[in-house]
C-alpha cells in the first residue's frame, strides 16, 4: 500500500492510493489532508483524532458507508469538509457538533433521502459554503434542515428527485449570496421562490423541466428582495412558460442580470407578456446573457417584437453560440441603451450584419464583439459598421478574412481593435490610424510596418517577426506583447527608442545568444521592470552550446566575444 | 484553402449500410454547418440534412429521418452519413456542403457516386 | 415544404446577350428584411458552386456579369453578357424554412 506524501507546510496528498482505511501515522503537524478516490468504506472514532491541527479533509468518491459519530471530534480547527460522492445512506448530526470552525461543508452525492433526523447544523456558526443532496434520492426538505444556519455565501441543493418540499424550509438563512438549485421540475418552484426572496442575491436554477411552470401570486407580503442575478443552466422552456417566469419579475425589482446558459427553447421566440406591467419591472436589468441556446426550430424564430419594449433599457448583451444568424434592423433599433453586445460564435456574414446594424441602430453600442461567425471582408465588415457613430471597441477575432486591402472604412470613435486568430499575413493601410489598441496575435504576420500615431497597447504574439517592430511607428506605445514570434535579439538602442514603453512581454522566441544580447541583459537589471516574463521566458535558442539557457544566466565565452 | 474532400464510389447490395465521409480543411471545422445534398442521376438537388460540430446538433429532411444517420469526428475534422436499408432508389451522387451565414453552401465536396445494386 | 419553381426548364440564349432564370416559391422567402434565396451553377460532373445568396449578394470570385435580384417569393438571376462557359444548369434554394429544398433546375443552351 502506497503512502502519503505531505509537503513541509503540512499538506498532504493522497488521493487514489488504493487506501482501504484512513492511513495510520496521521499527526498534528497536518494542515490539510486529501484521502479522495480511495476505498475507505469506514471511518472510525480514533482515525482521526491526532489531526488536532487540520484545516482541510477531502475525502471525496472514497466509498466511505460508515462514519463513527465521534469520528470528527477532535476536528476543531477544521475549515473544509469534503465528502461528496461516498455511500452515506444517513447523515448524522453528531458527525458535525466539533466542526466549530466550519466554513465549507459538501455532502453532495451520497444516498441519503433526508438531511437526517435532527438538524445537522446548528453549530456549524462560520459555514460559508454548503452543498448537499443527490441525483436519485434525495426527495425532501424539511423545515428542521436548514435550522441553526443564518447566513451563507453559496448554497448548493440537488434535489433532481425532489417529492416534498416543506412550506418555509429556506426562509430561516437570513443571507445567501449565491443558491443553486438543481431541479428536475418545477413543481415546487413557486414555493421556493418566496422562501428565498427576502435572502438571495443571486439564484441559479439548474436542469430544470420549465415547460409546464404556470405563474400563480406569492404568498409574500411587500418584500424589497436583494436578488440581482438570476441564471437559467440546462433549463427548458417554451414560449408559454417564458411569459409565465417573467410575472416572477415583479418580485425582484432589484434584479440586474440574467443570463440563459445551455438551456433549451422549444418555441419560436413568440412571447407575449400578458400584463404590461412586467415592462416596468424589468426596468433594472442591465445585463442579459445567453450562452448555447438550442432552439430546434431556429429558423422559424420570431423578431421578438413583443418584447422590444422589455429591451429598451438593457445595457449589455450577450447571445453566444447559438446560432445566431440575422438580428433583425426593428430588433436593434429598440435597443437604445445598449453599451456591449457579444455575439460570439455566431453565424453572423457581413451581408446579413447590414440589416442588423442598420441606421438607427444600437445608437448607444460602444462594444460589439463578433468573434468568430463567418465573417469573410474586413473592408464589408468596417464599412457596414459605420452606422455605429459611438462604437470605440470592435472584436471581430477568430474570422478567417481575405486578403487585407489598403483603405478601410471603420466608425469615427473606434480605438480597440482586436483581429487576433484571423488568418491575415499582411497588415496594411485598412487599419485605422485612430486605434490605441491593436491586438493581431495569432496570425500569420512576418513584418508589422504600419504607423499607428496613438497606439498604446500592440500585442502582437504567436506570429513569425524576426525584430521587434520599428518604434518610430508607434511614439506612444505603452505596451507591446511580442511573445512566440521568431525575434532573435532586442538591444538598449532598439529598447531605448520605445519612449514611453512600460511593459514588454517578449518570452519563447528565438534568441540568438550573441556577445550583444548577452552583454545587454548582464549590463541592464532594469529589464525586469519593463520585461514581465523575465526571465524565466527568455531561453537561447543559439548557439547549440546555449540552448534551452536562460539568457539571464547565460554566458558568452571570452573567446568569441573578444575575438 | 477550403477543401471538403469526400470519399470515394460505393457500390452496395440492397438492404445493407453505406458510410460516406467528408473531410475538412482549411478551415476551423467547428465553427461552419455540414450539410448533405443528394442527386439522383440526370436529376434536381435534395437536400438531406446538417449537422453542426460545435455541438452535434442536426436537422433533417423528413424524407431522410430514416434514411440517414449525421454523425462528425472534430479531431480528425470529418464528418459522416450513414445510409441504412439501401435500394435502387439511394443510387444517387451524394454531396457534403460547408454551410456558412446559416443559409448557403459555399465550399461543395466533389461528391460520392452510391450504386446500389444486387 | 416551401416549393421552387424554375422556369424555362431550358433556355436558350446567344453568347454575349442577357440570360434571366426566374425562380417563384410557394411561400414568401423573407426573414425580417432578407430574402433567404440562393443560385447555384452547376457543371457536368461538378458539385454545384454558389453564385449569389441573400437574393442579390454576389458571393466572392463570382464574375461580376451574374446578379440576383427580387423579395418575397418570385426571384431571378441574371447573366449579362452571357458567356460560353455559362451554357450550363442552374438552381435555386431556399432556407427560410426546413426543409431546405431547390428549384427544378434551368438549363442555359445557345441559341
Known amino acids: 500500500q502506497e503512502s502519503l506524501s505531505c509537503d513541509a507546510s503540512g499538506v498532504c496528498d493522497g488521493r487514489s492510493r488504493s487506501f482501504t482505511s484512513i492511513p495510520s501515522g496521521l499527526t498534528a503537524a497536518m494542515k490539510s489532508l486529501d484521502l479522495s478516490f480511495n476505498k475507505i468504506t469506514y471511518i472510525g472514532h480514533g482515525d482521526l483524532r491526532a489531526c488536532a491541527n487540520l484545516q482541510v479533509l477531502i475525502l471525496k468518491s472514497s466509498r466511505i458507508n460508515t462514519i463513527e459519530g465521534d469520528a470528527f471530534y477532535s476536528l476543531g480547527s477544521l475549515e473544509h469538509l469534503d465528502l461528496s460522492d461516498n455511500h452515506l445512506s444517513s447523515l448524522s448530526s453528531s458527525w458535525f457538533g466539533p466542526l466549530s470552525s466550519l466554513k465549507y461543508l459538501n455532502l453532495m452525492g451520497n444516498p441519503y433521502q433526508t438531511l437526517g433526523v435532527t438538524s445537522l447544523f446548528p453549530n456549524l456558526t462560520n459555514l460559508q459554503t454548503l452543498r448537499i443532496g443527490n441525483v436519485e434520492t434525495f426527495s425532501e426538505i424539511r423545515r428542521i434542515d436548514f435550522a441553526g444556519l443564518t447566513s451563507l455565501n453559496e448554497l448548493e441543493i440537488k434535489a433532481l428527485s425532489l417529492r416534498n418540499y416543506q412550506s418555509q424550509s429556506l426562509k430561516s438563512i437570513r443571507d445567501i449570496h449565491h443558491l443553486t438549485l438543481h431541479l428536475s421540475e418545477s413543481a415546487f418552484l413557486l414555493e421556493i421562490f418566496a422562501d428565498i426572496l427576502s435572502s438571495v442575491r443571486y439564484l441559479e436554477l439548474r436542469d430544470t423541466n420549465l415547460a409546464r411552470f404556470q405563474f400563480s401570486p406569492l404568498p409574500v407580503d411587500e418584500v424589497s428582495s436583494p436578488m440581482k442575478k438570476l441564471a437559467f443552466r440546462g433549463s427548458v422552456l417554451t414560449d408559454e412558460s417564458f411569459n409565465e417566469l417573467l410575472k416572477l419579475l415583479r418580485y425582484i425589482l432589484e434584479l440586474s442580470e440574467v443570463e440563459f446558459d445551455d438551456c433549451t427553447l422549444n418555441g419560436l421566440g413568440d412571447f407575449n407578456p400578458s400584463e404590461s406591467d412586467v415592462v416596468s419591472e424589468l426596468g433594472k436589468v442591465e445585463t442579459v446573457t445567453i450562452r448555447r441556446l438550442h432552439i430546434p426550430q431556429f429558423y422559424l424564430f420570431y423578431d421578438l417584437s413583443t418584447v422590444y419594449s422589455l429591451l429598451e433599457k438593457v445595457k449589455r448583451i450577450t447571445v453566444e453560440n447559438s446560432k445566431v444568424f440575422l438580428v433583425p434592423c426593428s430588433f436593434s433599433q429598440h435597443l437604445k441603451s445598449l453599451e456591449f453586445l457579444d455575439l460570439s460564435e455566431n453565424l453572423m456574414v457581413e451581408e446579413y450584419l447590414k440589416n442588423s446594424a442598420c441606421k438607427g441602430a444600437w445608437p448607444s453600442l460602444q462594444t460589439l464583439v463578433l468573434s468568430q461567425n463567418h465573417l469573410r471582408s474586413m473592408q464589408k465588415t468596417g464599412e457596414i459598421l459605420l452606422t455605429l457613430k459611438n462604437l470605440t471597441s470592435l472584436d471581430i477575432s477568430r474570422n478567417t478574412f481575405h486578403p487585407m486591402p489598403d483603405s478601410c472604412q471603420w466608425p469615427e470613435k473606434m480605438r480597440f481593435l482586436n483581429l487576433s486568430s484571423t488568418g491575415i499575413r499582411v497588415v496594411k493601410t485598412c487599419i485605422p490610424q485612430t486605434l490605441e489598441v491593436l491586438d493581431v496575435s495569432n496570425n500569420n504576420l512576418d513584418s508589422f510596418s504600419l504607423f499607428l500615431p496613438r497606439l498604446q497597447e500592440l500585442y502582437i504574439s504567436r506570429n513569425k517577426l524576426k525584430t521587434l517592430p520599428d518604434a518610430s511607428l508607434f511614439p506612444v506605445l505603452l505596451v507591446m506583447k511580442i511573445r512566440e514570434n521568431a525575434v532573435s535579439t532586442f538591444s538598449k538602442d532598439q529598447l531605448g527608442s520605445f519612449p514611453k514603453l512600460e511593459t514588454l512581454e517578449a518570452g519563447d522566441n528565438h534568441f540568438v545568444c550573441s556577445c550583444e544580447l548577452l552583454s545587454f541583459t548582464m549590463e541592464t537589471p532594469a529589464l525586469a521592470q519593463i520585461l514581465v516574463d523575465w526571465p524565466d521566458s527568455y531561453l537561447c535558442d543559439s548557439p547549440p552550446r546555449l540552448h534551452g539557457h536562460r539568457l539571464q544566466d547565460a554566458r558568452p565565452s571570452v573567446l568569441e566575444c573578444h575575438q | 484553402q477550403v477543401q471538403l474532400q469526400q470519399s470515394g464510389p460505393e457500390l452496395v447490395n440492397p438492404g445493407a449500410s453505406v458510410k460516406l465521409s467528408c473531410k475538412a480543411s482549411?478551415?476551423?471545422?467547428?465553427?461552419?454547418?455540414i450539410n448533405w445534398v443528394k442527386q439522383g442521376p440526370g436529376q434536381g438537388l435534395e437536400w438531406i440534412g446538417w449537422?453542426?460540430?460545435?455541438?452535434?446538433?442536426?436537422n433533417f429532411n423528413e424524407n431522410f429521418k430514416d434514411k440517414a444517420a449525421l454523425t462528425v469526428d472534430t479531431s480528425s475534422s470529418t464528418a459522416y452519413m450513414e445510409l441504412h436499408s439501401l435500394t435502387s432508389e439511394d443510387s444517387a451522387v451524394y454531396f457534403c456542403?460547408?454551410?456558412?451565414?446559416?443559409?448557403?453552401?459555399?465550399?461543395w465536396g466533389q461528391g460520392t457516386t452510391l450504386t446500389v445494386s444486387s | 415544404d416551401i416549393v421552387l419553381t424554375q422556369s424555362p426548364a431550358s433556355l436558350a440564349v446567344s453568347l454575349g446577350q442577357r440570360a434571366t432564370i426566374s425562380c417563384r416559391a410557394s411561400?414568401?422567402?423573407?426573414?425580417?428584411?432578407?430574402?433567404?434565396m440562393q443560385w447555384y451553377q452547376q457543371k457536368p460532373g461538378q458539385p454545384p458552386k454558389l453564385l449569389i445568396f441573400g437574393a442579390s449578394n454576389v458571393e466572392s470570385g463570382v464574375p461580376v456579369r451574374f446578379s440576383g435580384s427580387g423579395s418575397g417569393t418570385d426571384f431571378s438571376l441574371n447573366i449579362h453578357p452571357v458567356e460560353e462557359d455559362d451554357i450550363v444548369m442552374y438552381f435555386c434554394q431556399q432556407s427560410r424554412k426546413l426543409p431546405w429544398t431547390f428549384g427544378g433546375g434551368t438549363k442555359l443552351e445557345i441559341k
Open positions: 482549411g478551415f476551423t471545422f467547428t465553427t461552419y454547418g
Open positions: 449537422i453542426y460540430p460545435r455541438d452535434g446538433s442536426t
Open positions: 456542403a460547408r454551410l456558412t451565414g446559416g443559409t448557403f453552401l459555399d465550399y
Open positions: 411561400e414568401s422567402v423573407e426573414y425580417y428584411g432578407t430574402s433567404l
